[in-house]
């Protein structure tokens, strides 16, 4: 089923960084056009355990007050699934020295629930978004971002952690999902596919986009990521789909042009501060929201996901650079670093705008199959 054409209301209309033109329905491949690629090839369809990069590469974390951000986020969290006690430890080299949570990969062994039991939870991410079934929630107000336009100094840490490319963000990037729902940005990273193969984590009516950006935030109610993991609303992720467009995206180029320097797994570089908000769509008012999980071990639940309706445009060359430059574990290319979509298990995805419109000519009024749950309570 194709997404309806609705001037400015068309779910997942294109444009970003100042480009507001929504895509028409012909611009979005239908489910028939692109097979529903739940997993990267060769991956077993085990619930809750497939693919994804260091999206929640949240390791030993502590409030930070300088260039690398409010929290230390080099690789993986020091925490197991909530409820599993663990001694505090220095974890800067977990990925190299090996502790259970660092030994996961996309596809193959070990099964993620063995790495972290939470990966077998009932409310996991990513999910398939079906706008027709989303509950329109007028209480979902435009997102508020403050301090995202960073000066060039100090430089930021850009790292190939073997699962993704991650940019650690400094303190001072504040985001509000609504009144009293305030967060601090910690890091951002990307998920992508391979040549001719899309690699977003979330899908829309089965359609997978070329890539996806995740900006990970910690609730201001918590001082540390390990305190917030598993707590409802403890973490929040802003997600946007990346699509191919005719022009180079200058904001993304500031990062993509540096990927060659960090081609090797575990390598990193310093990049000038930039306008982080320019990496996101320009329309902060139209989005989908649901409660899910980290998409990589430890797969902790309680994460508030906000998926922008508008997409971000990158050139074909930029998307190729993203998917074809980095190397991961075992001399393999870092590609297809996305987890399979997970079952909703009764969850209702909310929309900040009336996304569920029946595209047939008979429908004079929007059809909302789900009602809004009290958002923001």
């Amino acid at each position: 089923q194709r997404l309806p054409r609705m001037q400015e209301d068309s779910p997942l209309g294109g444009g970003s960084s100042g480009e507001d033109d929504p895509l028409g329905e012909e611009d979005l491949p239908s489910e028939e056009d692109s097979p529903r690629e739940e997993d990267p090839p060769g991956e077993e369809d085990l619930p809750g355990e497939e693919d994804l990069p260091g999206e929640e590469d949240l390791p030993e974390v502590k409030p930070k007050s300088e260039e690398e951000g409010s929290l230390k986020l080099e690789d993986l969290p020091t925490v197991e699934a909530p409820g599993d006690p663990q001694e505090p430890q220095n974890n800067a080299h977990r990925d190299k020295e090996g502790d259970d949570q660092s030994h996961w990969r996309y596809g193959g062994d070990p099964p993620w629930p063995r790495v972290s039991p939470a990966c077998a939870g009932r409310f996991q991410s990513p999910v398939d978004i079906r706008p027709q079934l989303a509950a329109f929630c007028p209480a979902l107000r435009p997102l508020e971002l403050l301090g995202f336009q960073l000066p060039p100094l100090p430089e930021l840490r850009l790292r190939n952690n073997g699962h993704s490319v991650q940019l650690t963000l400094p303190p001072g990037l504040e985001m509000a999902l609504g009144p009293g729902r305030e967060y601090r940005a910690l890091q951002l990273h990307l998920h992508w596919g391979a040549a001719g193969r899309p690699g977003s984590e979330h899908t829309v009516e089965g359609h997978r986009f070329p890539a996806e950006i995740h900006v990970v935030h910690l609730s201001t109610a918590f001082a540390r990521v390990d305190e917030a993991l598993g707590r409802p609303g403890g973490l929040a992720v802003l997600a946007a789909f990346l699509e191919e467009g005719p022009e180079e995206n200058s904001a993304y180029e500031q990062l993509l042009s540096r990927l060659e320097e960090i081609a090797e797994e575990g390598s990193e570089t310093q990049v000038p501060g930039l306008d982080i908000s320019a990496l996101l769509p320009s329309d902060f008012s139209r989005y989908f929201q649901y409660e899910g999980s980290l998409t990589t071990p430890p797969c902790a639940q309680g994460v508030i996901w906000t998926v922008f309706n508008q997409t971000v445009m990158l050139s074909a060359k930029q998307l190729h650079t993203l998917s074809d430059t980095l190397w991961g574990p075992g001399d393999s290319r870092l590609q297809l670093n996305f987890r399979a979509t997970q079952p909703l298990n009764g969850r209702v995805i909310e929309a900040s705008f009336p996304a569920g419109v029946d595209s047939s000519p008979r429908a004079a009024e929007p059809v909302q199959l789900n009602s809004c749950l009290a958002a923001g309570d």
Epitope: S65, E66, A92, P152, L153, P154, R157, P170, R258, P272
Partner: antibody
Framework: QVTLKESGGGVVQPGTSLRLSCAAS????????MTWVRQAPGKGLEWVGL????????HYTDSVKGRFTISRDNAKNSLYLQMNTLRADDTAVYYC?????????WGQGTLVTVSS | VLTQPPSVSVAPGQTARITCGGN??????VHWYQQKPGQAPVLVIY???DRPSGIPERFSGSNSGNTATLTISRVEAGDEADYYC????????????FGGGTKLTVL
């Protein structure tokens, strides 16, 4: 590999000027912020100042503000430190280094002696 | 202000610990440099505990509260040098701040 080489040091009298240069190679110079650090004889390291990748932003330590100016020419892969109104306590080995938050590569340094 | 002990002495094969004190330094990232006589400093630890390539695993770092620590295990004669801690402090005009340095003597 990354190489940084300072030049321009020497013996000068108080109140005069000197310009230090740092030639960079082995990396894309225009991608990185650059830092000057100095070390007085027998003393510790002291940050002098730094400049952003494109030269648009500079920061200085208090003791050199208004006297020292950091600049760069990305086309020439070169970093500069213009030192005016030099004082005896500016005597030190001056190092250029790559990076702002931390300095991952350093030059070998050039000695500046300010003496009457 | 970052405070380091002026000197630390240790026998070969033992473990040396060099501290760097500062108000709530645990909220900042600490970087460590080694400097041998007549040479330029070398980065040995960055972001509290990460090691640049080429630095032996014997070098490690930690940071919490008001103290950051550089630990050198199985100390060798070649480790004798001055060690400096450093932070970025955007809240002050001195954006890059170095500790006073610690002379490590291998007995």
């Amino acid at each position: 590999q990354v190489t940084l080489k300072e030049s321009g040091g020497g013996v000068v009298q108080p109140g005069t000027s000197l310009r230090l240069s740092c030639a960079a190679s082995g990396f894309t110079f225009s991608n990185y912020a650059m830092t000057w650090v100095r070390q007085a004889p027998g003393k510790g390291l002291e940050w002098v100042g730094l400049i952003s990748y494109d030269g648009s932003v500079t920061h200085y330590t208090d003791s050199v503000k208004g006297r020292f100016t950091i600049s760069r020419d990305n086309a020439k892969n070169s970093l500069y430190l213009q030192m005016n109104t030099l004082r005896a306590d500016d005597t030190a080995v001056y190092y250029c280094a790559r990076g702002s938050g931390y300095q991952e590569h350093w030059g070998q340094g050039t000695l500046v002696t300010v003496s009457s | 202000v970052l405070t380091q002990p002026p000197s630390v002495s240790v026998a070969p094969g033992q473990t040396a610990r060099i501290t760097c004190g500062g108000n709530n330094i645990g909220s900042k990232s600490v970087h460590w440099y080694q400097q041998k006589p007549g040479q330029a400093p070398v980065l040995v630890i960055y972001y509290d505990s990460d090691r640049p390539s080429g630095i032996p695993e014997r070098f490690s770092g930690s940071n919490s509260g008001n103290t950051a620590t550089l630990t050198i295990s199985r100390v060798e004669a070649g480790d004798e040098a001055d060690y400096y801690c450093q932070v970025w402090d955007s809240s002050s005009d001195h954006h890059v701040v170095f500790g006073g340095g610690t002379k490590l003597t291998v007995l």
